[in-house]
Structure formats: structure tokens, C-alpha cells
Interface confidence: low
């Protein structure tokens, strides 16, 4: 079937359109194009005879049409009037006529639109704005864009006038956006430039920052006011209702309690004519004074005096804090706080209570600390110590003794020899001593503040001959595998060599034996019963030597697992049962017996005369060493058979 296709169907003015013929019959005579839906000679555009290849223009020919051999028609420089139907009349060679109609539509190429507005500065919540898309164009579709998005659904947005007009009712600040309109027809689409809607709004209720409403005297007050507004607001400050200044910020340096009050910020928008205010109440608190500590006793005596430290000044509704040595107060029965925490009492002061002490006044803005206070605790003197610790000296050497006693204030020292005052110094020096310098040397320490005195007496022996030494022990009854024992050779003497013997032999090499303190001390670690020997120490110098009496180490051990004798376990009826129990132990253990779990006698020997089969059972010997706190036991089974029933049985004793 003969058909006409319009390419394109929608044609822009000034462009061209091709009316393309499909299924053109063969053996044609010619064809002719007409404007309209039917063949009308008055509206012929052009005719073509194939045989002559002659094209003949018709009444409707405009000079813009070109006919092709395949019967298609090209129309150039399309005008609006070209819109409509076109009919092709085909005359076949057999003069059979055939017709086909096609059509196209002509649209103008749209101009770039623009937006007109009925209100350039609408006021929020009051005005409406009508945007109109210009120009008005026939057969055009109008579209709107807000911030390059299609229009949101909103009851405040209304399209009218064929969508050419966009009305915003009761504008809000959120309507401040980029608006564009777009015109469309089938052949073109054009978008306008952006129009920014300038919504006048505010001022909103201003916000005053910072939010803090409490200040301390002496601080700077710096308040800033802000209110959302277009155009930007003009600001005024009022204090207690009195105008201060027309600025966005209010600055008052070095405020006092008198600056407490209501602070009002007023924001004004000259375009909307609106005013809004916000009030904040500022409270200025007086700065608490720096605290200080008073004491009821500036020179307390150790173990005698109590000291009450008071945090000054007394302020109502204030929390008092205390620190000792930069730490919070330790828990101690000697430290007592008053109900209001203002007074800290130290009961029975010690030398360790010197401090420093600090008190603080706390408010929720800060903690104010006092200066530290140090207690001058009077103590001592303690028992003086005389050094060096030697008690034996050789004639001809220098004797230099030093005395020290812990004391506050520092002790005053005096030396006495055999009760006679010598000198008031901390050190005593005697050169080139002789045997006559032997005696009792007393150091006396005196605390002038407390009035207390303490003395220490040391026996000094000056002799060319060394004395007979003796052995002291730190543990007279060590327990095996548990205790260590330290033997010390006395006395301590200058320029002296110390030697040790065990059972008359020099010391064996053993990791459990250790010499220290210039060989003066012999330590036995983890003593065993084999260490229960005779220990002798010796001292010697260039002119003499001497040995101590032996000291025998009494090692407590055991009880070991006991042994029951005789070893027999089978007896004949009628025999005597005589069991003896023995356990190695120092001191000797306590023995007890149990037969079949039933306690018997507390003896080392268990004797039962004329036993019978009723005496069958378990015989247990229990041993206990009260000194080591250890126990042990052994169990033996005894079988008693009737007389003559079994050969080889013991007849008993």
C-alpha cells in the first residue's frame, strides 16, 4: 500500500521536511503533490511526468519544493503555514490512480524565556509573589525549576495561566531560592536565567551568647547578640531597661556585683519594620578571698601536742577542702575535720606530720588554694647511735667516735667517759689511745626545745690482746628445711680477721653457707639436721688470735615416717604382741597408737598379752613434734591365727 512518511513529523520553522514515499508502484506514468487531504488542482504543488522527466509547478508551488524521482517531496525553509496534510496522486501506466496522504506540523523555534515578578522584596509570612514566564507563546508548555529541581508539592505553590505563572503564597525565608522557567514545544526547549527570590524576614528572637549567666567579680563580660534577619538586623543593648549602645556585641571589662541584672538585646529590621528582644539575667558573684591557714600551735611536740589548723576566712555556704603533701587527706584516726571542714585537727603529732598543708575554698566556678603551711614538729632526741660500732681497739690508734640522734631542733651532744663529762661536741676524738682509755663511753643527746635527753653507752676496750670472741645467733632452734640461721662473731673489732670452723674443720664449700659482714657473719640457709654441729669463730690481728667456745646448732626436725618393730605381721593366738614405734625427731616426738582407728595409749611401746583373732586389724603409730609443728604416722596390719592352724607363724615373745 502506498504510504507517506514525514521526516521529521514536527518541523521547526526554517528547517526542511522530507515527505518520503513508501511502496511506490512500478510502471508509473507520473505523479503529482497537492496541499491538503485531497486532490485539488487549485492546490497542486508540482507534477512530474516520468516519460519526459518533466516537472511542472502548480498553483501551490512556492519555489521551496523539490521532487525526486522516487516521488518523495522535500520542502525547505519551512514556514508556519506549511503545517498540514499533503496528498500524493500517483498515475500508473495503466492509468490506475492511487493516492496517499501524509502530514507534518510546524512549530516555531522558541526564544530564551525570562521571568517577571510582581514583588521584588516580599516580606515573610505576609506577601505573595507571582512569577510569570515571558513571552507568551502558542503551543508551548511551561515548566518551573527551583534550585534546579522540579517544583515541590506545596499548598503555598500555585501554577496558573497555563502554567505560565507561578504564585508563592505567604512566602517564607525558605523560599529564598533560584527560580527558572522553561518553555517547551515539540521542536525546542529553552530555560530562562535564574531569578533569586529575596525574601525579607525577621528579625527572629535574638540569641545572646555565651549562655553562661553566672560570672565572678573581676571578669570581663562579653555578650554577643544574633538574630536571623534579612536584611541583617540592627542591634541595641539595654541593661536593666536603660539603653547602652547600638552594637551587636556588648563588652564590659572588670565587672562587679553591681553589674548583675537583666541584659536585653533588641534586634530591628528596617525593611520589615519589626523588632524582637531577648533578655538574659546576669548574676555576678563576689570573688571569695584567697584562704589562709592559722595554727593554734606553731611548734608542737611529737606525741604530746595536738595541732588545730583552721582555714580562714569563715564564709557561709562554702565548701572547705584540705590537702596534705599535695594529696587529699588520708584516712587516719589522728586526723579530724570539723563539721564544716574548716578546721583540721592533728591529734598527737608526729615528725611525719610536717606537711605541707593547704586549704581551699571551693565554689563551682573554681577552687581557691591557700599558701602551703609547714608544721615545725619538735621531736627527739631518739636514742643516739655511736659510730663506728667497734668495741675493741689496739693501743696507739686514734679513737674517733661520732654520735647522732634524730631530733628537731638538732640535738646538743655531750660525751662522758666513765661518767665524767668530756666535751660538748657531736664527735669525740682521742689520739694515740692506750689501755687506760678503756672504759664506758656515753653520748648524751639533748633537745633544748622539748627538754628531753637520751643517752647511749658503749664499752671501749683498748688492748693489744684480742678478747675471746663469742658467737651470737639470730635463731637458737631453727626448723629443718625451713629456717636460716645467722651466726655473728662478737665483738666487732678494728683491723681484725674473722675465721670460722665447723666440727674443728674449716668451712666446707656449700651454696647453703654464706659469709658476710667482713666474714663476721656466717649464714646457713635452709638448715638440715646435718647442720647440728659445733661452730667456732676466731679473731686475729697482727699481734694476737683467739677462738670462741663452740656453739652447737640445735636443729629441730622431724618427725620422720615412723618404723614399727618387730616387722612381723602374723601371730599365733595366745602370743604376746609387743610393738615398738620409732621416728627420727628433734626434740623426741610424742607417740600414740590407734587400733582399727580407735585411740589407744600415748606410749612408744604397745603391749597386748595373749592375743586372739579378735586382735586382728590395723595398728597405727602416730608421731608428733610440737616444736616443728609436724606430724607423721605409719599403719601396720596384724593377723592373729588360731594355735596350730598354720605352720611358720610367730610364737610371740
Amino acid at each position: 500500500k502506498l504510504t507517506i512518511e514525514s521526516t521529521p513529523f514536527n518541523v521547526a520553522e526554517g528547517k526542511e521536511v522530507l515527505l518520503l514515499v513508501h511502496n511506490l508502484p512500478q510502471h508509473l506514468f507520473g505523479y503529482s503533490w497537492y496541499k491538503g487531504e485531497r486532490v485539488d488542482g487549485n492546490r497542486q504543488i508540482i507534477g512530474y511526468v516520468i516519460g519526459t522527466q518533466q516537472a511542472t509547478p502548480g498553483p501551490a508551488y512556492s519555489g521551496r519544493e523539490i521532487i525526486y524521482p522516487n516521488a518523495s517531496l522535500l520542502i525547505q525553509n519551512i514556514i508556519q503555514n506549511d503545517t498540514g496534510f499533503y496528498t500524493l496522486h500517483v498515475i500508473k501506466s495503466d492509468l490506475v490512480n492511487e493516492e496517499a496522504t501524509g502530514q507534518f506540523r510546524v512549530y516555531p523555534e522558541l526564544p530564551k524565556p525570562s521571568i517577571s515578578s510582581n514583588n521584588s522584596k516580599p516580606v515573610e509570612d505576609k506577601d505573595a509573589v507571582a512569577f510569570t514566564c515571558e513571552p507568551e507563546t502558542q503551543d508551548a508548555t511551561y515548566l518551573w525549576w527551583v534550585n534546579n529541581q522540579s517544583l515541590p508539592v506545596s499548598p503555598r505553590l500555585q501554577l496558573s495561566n497555563g502554567n505560565r505563572t507561578l504564585t508563592l503564597f505567604n512566602v517564607t525565608r525558605n523560599d529564598t531560592a533560584s527560580y527558572k522557567c522553561e518553555t517547551q514545544n515539540p521542536v525546542s526547549a529553552r530555560r530562562s536565567d535564574s531569578v533569586i527570590l529575596n525574601v525579607l524576614y525577621g528579625p527572629d528572637a535574638p540569641t545572646i551568647s555565651p549562655l553562661n549567666t553566672s560570672y565572678r567579680s573581676g571578669e570581663n563580660l562579653n555578650l554577643s547578640c544574633h538574630a536571623a534577619s534579612n536584611p541583617p538586623a540592627q542591634y541595641s543593648w539595654f541593661v536593666n531597661g536603660t539603653f547602652q549602645q547600638s552594637t551587636q556585641e556588648l563588652f564590659i571589662p572588670n565587672i562587679t556585683v553591681n553589674n548583675s541584672g537583666s541584659y536585653t538585646c533588641q534586634a530591628h529590621n528596617s525593611d520589615t519594620g519589626l523588632n524582637r528582644t531577648t533578655v538574659t539575667t546576669i548574676t555576678v558573684y563576689a570573688e571569695p578571698p584567697k584562704p589562709f591557714i592559722t595554727s593554734n600551735n606553731s611548734n608542737p611536740v611529737e606525741d604530746e601536742d595536738a595541732v588545730a589548723l583552721t582555714c580562714e576566712p569563715e564564709i557561709q555556704n562554702t565548701t572547705y577542702l584540705w590537702w596534705v603533701n599535695n594529696q587529699s587527706l588520708p584516712v587516719s584516726p589522728r586526723l579530724q575535720l570539723s563539721n564544716d571542714n574548716r578546721t583540721l585537727t592533728l591529734l598527737s603529732v608526729t615528725r611525719n606530720d610536717v606537711g605541707p598543708y593547704e586549704c581551699g575554698i571551693q565554689n563551682e566556678l573554681s577552687v581557691d588554694h591557700s599558701d602551703p603551711v609547714i608544721l615545725n614538729v619538735l621531736y627527739g632526741p631518739d636514742d643516739p647511735t655511736i659510730s663506728p660500732s667497734y668495741t675493741y681497739y689496739r693501743p696507739g690508734v686514734n679513737l674517733s667516735l661520732s654520735c647522732h640522734a634524730a631530733s628537731n631542733p638538732p640535738a646538743q651532744y655531750s660525751w662522758l667517759i666513765d661518767g665524767n663529762i668530756q666535751q660538748h661536741t657531736q664527735e669525740l676524738f682521742i689520739s694515740n689511745i692506750t689501755e687506760k682509755n678503756s672504759g664506758l663511753y656515753t653520748c648524751q643527746a639533748n633537745n633544748s626545745a622539748s627538754g628531753h635527753s637520751r643517752t647511749t653507752v658503749k664499752t671501749i676496750t683498748v688492748s693489744a690482746e684480742l678478747p675471746k670472741p663469742s658467737i651470737s645467733s639470730n635463731n637458737s632452734k631453727p626448723v629443718e628445711d625451713k629456717d636460716a640461721v645467722a651466726f655473728t662473731c662478737e665483738p666487732e673489732a678494728q683491723n681484725t680477721t674473722y675465721l670460722w670452723w665447723v666440727n674443728g674443720q674449716s668451712l666446707p664449700v656449700s651454696p647453703r653457707l654464706q659469709l658476710s659482714n667482713g666474714n663476721r657473719t656466717l649464714t646457713l640457709f635452709n638448715v638440715t639436721r646435718n647442720d647440728a654441729r659445733a661452730y667456732v669463730c676466731g679473731i686475729q690481728n697482727s699481734v694476737s688470735a683467739n677462738r670462741s667456745d663452740p656453739v652447737t646448732l640445735d636443729v629441730l626436725y622431724g618427725p620422720d615416717t615412723p618404723i614399727i618393730s618387730p616387722p612381723d605381721s602374723s601371730y599365733l593366738s595366745g602370743a604376746n604382741l609387743n610393738l615398738s614405734c620409732h621416728s627420727a625427731s628433734n626434740p623426741s616426738p610424742q607417740y600414740s597408737w590407734r587400733i582399727n582407728g580407735i585411740p589407744q595409749q600415748h606410749t612408744q611401746v604397745l603391749f597386748i598379752a595373749k592375743i586372739t583373732p579378735n586382735n586382728n586389724g590395723t595398728y597405727a603409730c602416730f608421731v608428733s613434734n610440737l616444736a616443728t609443728g609436724r606430724n607423721n604416722s605409719i599403719v601396720k596390719s596384724i593377723t592373729v591365727s588360731a594355735s596350730g592352724t598354720s605352720p611358720g607363724l610367730s610364737a610371740g615373745a
Epitope: S214, R216, T283, N317, Q362, E364
Partner: antibody
Framework: EVQLLESGGGLVQPGGSLRLSCAAS????????MGWVRRAPGKGLEWVSS????????SYADSVKGRFTISRDNSKNTLYLQMNSLRAEDTAVYYC??????????????WGQGTLVTVSS | DIQMTQSPSSLSASVGDRVTITCRAS??????LNWYQEKPGKAPKLLIY???SLQSGVPSRFSGSGSGTDFTLTISSLQPEDFATYYC????????FGQGTKLEIK
């Protein structure tokens, strides 16, 4: 959002003990003073005790002094009230409340919903 | 200890009325006085602190005044939600409360 949640209330016999807890959130507990207030049935509010931010300072009403102990654990954001030697007149709703951080601990700006303590044989 | 005396102990009023509650301290407490509102089954709520400072979020119809020993809480125009019990509290030591004023609907 500031929240104070009391727990530990209940029925206890005269002479008995009870420990109330108050779990705090939504503010810096370790720097806030805290307190306990109670309201006996048919009576008005009675301040019971308060404690400083670092447990340095504690204060008690005369009616509970020597029997009640206020304490806090800043690591757990929890306030406690240990109540010993309880009496019938201690029966009340006990509220945990916060003193604001500024300017001084002089008012109670946030309160819990309370926990009921009933002392009865 | 400082004693706080509130008056009246109860009060009947209508919506829209102006209401005044007074609190007297047995000795001067400067401006360390607070006002609280309590409703049945609910926690007390701070209204006014430091005698006259309005707590954040409290309607401006509530106001406080006074210093020393005599203090006043004023509700300028009673609203239905204002019917409750009101307590003053001094912030000395201890922080004692007044005995309360019950505000009822007339």
C-alpha cells in the same frame, strides 16, 4: 539530656539498713554536687544530705546524722545513700537531685523520679 | 539551724488570678532562696533560684523577689497547670525547705 534514676528502695524493718543508688547521665557527674531530698507521706520536702564533687564535703540533716552516709563513685556516675538504724519516721519517697555547676551549689535544678522507702514491722 | 516559714499553707484561686506566696527565714539568708513546684506523683521542679532568677524553661509568669529574711513568689496570671504545691528552700546550712503552700482551684 540530664537523667537521674534512683533505685534500692523497698520495705525494711525498724533498725534495718538499706542502700539507695542514683545513676546519673547527660552531664559531667564528677564535677557536680549531688544531694538527697525526701518527702514523707502527707508531709513536705525535707533535705537529707549533700556531697561535693570529689567527696570532700558531705552534709546531713540533724534527723539523719550518724545514721545515714552519703557517698559517690565518679567512675560509675553513681550517688549512694547508706541508711542504717532505720526508723518508721524515715518512711518517705527519696529523691536524688543535682546541684548545678555554676555559680555555687545553691539550688537543685534536676531531680529523679524518686524511690519509696517503707520502714515498718 | 535556719527555719523557713511559708504562708499561707494553702490557697484557693482561679485561672487568671495573680497569686503571691511568701517565705520568711528565721535569720538573714541574703538572696540564697529557691522556689520549687511539686505535683502529685512527679519530681519537684525548680522555678526560681537566688531569690529572683528564673530557671531556664520556666514560664515568665513566675517571678521571685526579696532578700534577707522576706521573700515572695508571684504568679502573674494563673494557668490550669499551675495548681500544685510550692516550696521555698534556703541555701544556707542545712538546706532546709519551707513547709509548703498548696495552691488549689477555687
Amino acid at each position: 539530656e540530664v537523667q537521674l534514676l534512683e533505685s534500692g528502695g523497698g520495705l525494711v524493718q525498724p533498725g534495718g539498713s538499706l542502700r539507695l543508688s542514683c545513676a546519673a547521665s547527660g552531664f559531667t557527674f564528677s564535677s557536680s554536687y549531688m544531694g538527697w531530698v525526701r518527702r514523707a507521706p502527707g508531709k513536705g520536702l525535707e533535705w537529707v544530705s549533700s556531697i561535693g564533687s570529689g567527696s570532700y564535703s558531705t552534709s546531713y540533716a540533724d534527723s539523719v546524722k550518724g545514721r545515714f552516709t552519703i557517698s559517690r563513685d565518679n567512675s560509675k556516675n553513681t550517688l549512694y545513700l547508706q541508711m542504717n538504724s532505720l526508723r518508721a519516721e524515715d518512711t518517705a519517697v527519696y529523691y536524688c537531685a543535682r546541684y548545678p555547676s555554676v555559680p555555687f551549689p545553691l539550688h537543685l535544678d534536676y531531680w529523679g523520679q524518686g524511690t519509696l522507702v517503707t520502714v515498718s514491722s | 539551724d535556719i527555719q523557713m516559714t511559708q504562708s499561707p499553707s494553702s490557697l484557693s484561686a482561679s485561672v487568671g488570678d495573680r497569686v503571691t506566696i511568701t517565705c520568711r527565714a528565721s535569720q538573714s539568708i541574703s538572696s540564697y532562696l529557691n522556689w520549687y513546684q511539686e505535683k502529685p506523683g512527679k519530681a519537684p521542679k525548680l522555678l526560681i533560684y537566688a531569690a529572683s532568677s528564673l530557671q531556664s524553661g520556666v514560664p515568665s509568669r513566675f517571678s521571685g523577689s526579696g532578700s534577707g529574711t522576706d521573700f515572695t513568689l508571684t504568679i502573674s496570671s494563673l494557668q490550669p497547670e499551675d495548681f500544685a504545691t510550692y516550696y521555698c528552700q534556703q541555701a544556707g546550712n542545712p538546706h532546709t525547705f519551707g513547709q509548703g503552700t498548696k495552691l488549689e482551684i477555687k
